[in-house]
């Protein structure tokens, strides 16, 4: 089977600072030199792009300057971090991997990671 399989954790809990990290791992059917990783958010049947980065194998993963995502790559594994999350951002985050070069192109889609975000309680006023 020449399909590309993508694995990601089923559930992740964001930190109190609204940061969630997870690993996206793909089994490559070919020797790719250029890989594109996209994080998608699926709510009901709507799919929206959260962030995307293209990297050359062996090089660092670079997201756009205004991206809420950062990441590092190591072989066929990408460590993704999404920042600035709030409770309303709780949902299913899908890791999509595309082997862009050389041909043939391959698409890999993970089953999604359910990220739970809990807004921190506001600090009570303290008397000094």
């Amino acid at each position: 089977c020449k399909a590309m399989h993508v694995a990601q954790p089923a559930v992740v809990l964001a930190s109190s600072r609204g940061i969630a990290s997870f690993v996206c791992e793909y089994a490559s059917p070919g020797k790719a030199t250029e890989v594109r990783v996209t994080v998608l958010r699926q709510a009901d049947s709507q799919v929206t792009e959260v962030c995307a980065a293209t990297y050359m194998m062996g090089n660092e993963l670079t997201f756009l300057d205004d991206s809420i995502c950062t990441g590092t790559s190591s072989g066929n594994q990408v460590n993704l971090t999404i920042q600035g999350l709030r409770a309303m951002d709780t949902g299913l985050y899908i890791c999509k991997v595309e082997l862009m070069y050389p041909p043939p192109y391959y698409l890999g889609i993970g089953n999604g990671t359910q990220i739970y975000v809990i807004d921190p309680e506001p600090c009570p006023d303290s008397d000094f």
């Epitope: 089977c1 590309m4 043939p104 192109y105 391959y106």
Partner: antibody
């Protein structure tokens, strides 16, 4: 809403060239891959080519490789197909189709007819 | 290249009946990357099902998809007059992307 409108079809002699365009609106064009798919009269669908995101990655069907060139202008939200050395078997309706974030072709234009005949 | 074959070539049924269309791949296709399209005469194709079983936006629930590996099925539970059309399967997991030859569902 997503809209794709093809243009540039017509009657052309074998060996000649033609350039098709597809104007896109209703979505952020640069964030999506776009395809050309063709359909010969009375026949099924045949994938022709795809171009990804910034235009640096392109893939073609063997039947058109070396003769057709797919390109895009993200500043004008437009997709192109340059068709050279046309043959009678290239006669078809040519559709542009957007790639959904999860991979299938979710939005299609109405098509433009290319007839290659002497 | 993954070759897709569809059967039957033509399916003659009456409105209200159940339609079962088959798509077979020459090699294993992950179910995540198998789609079904509907095409009516003079119109562009329309995405019905992706990921083998997920309905596209606005597609009625009488359409359902199933299958894995090399065998996939599109089922129309009760045919409506507007469902008589040609149906194509497609794999989009690797290039070249390929379509099946189509199944025509016509009125008996």
């Amino acid at each position: 809403q997503v809209q794709l409108v093809e243009s540039g079809g017509g009657v052309v002699q074998p060996g000649r060239s033609l350039r098709l365009s597809c104007a896109a609106s209703g979505f952020t064009f640069s964030r999506f891959g776009v395809n050309w798919v063709r359909q010969a009269p009375g026949k099924g669908l045949e994938w022709v080519a795809v171009i990804w995101y910034d235009g640096s990655n392109k893939y073609y069907a063997d039947s058109v490789k070396g003769r057709f060139t797919i390109s895009r202008d993200n500043s004008k939200n437009t997709l192109f197909l340059q068709m050279n050395s046309l043959r009678a078997e290239d006669t078809a309706v040519y559709y542009c189709a957007r790639v959904h974030q999860l991979g299938p072709f979710d939005s299609w234009g109405q098509g433009t007819l290319v007839t290659v005949s002497s | 290249e993954i070759v897709l074959t569809q059967s039957p070539g033509t399916l003659s049924l009456s409105p209200g009946e159940r339609a079962t269309l088959s798509c077979r791949a020459s090699q294993s296709v992950s179910s995540s990357y198998l789609a079904w399209y509907q095409q009516k005469p003079g119109q562009a194709p329309r995405l019905l099902i992706y990921g083998a079983s997920s309905r596209a936006t606005g597609i009625p629930d009488r359409f359902s998809g199933s299958g894995s590996g090399t065998d996939f099925t599109l089922t129309i539970s009760r045919l409506e007059p507007e469902d008589f059309a040609v149906y194509y399967c497609q794999q989009y997991g690797s290039s070249p992307f390929t379509f099946g030859p189509g199944t025509k569902v016509d009125i008996k």
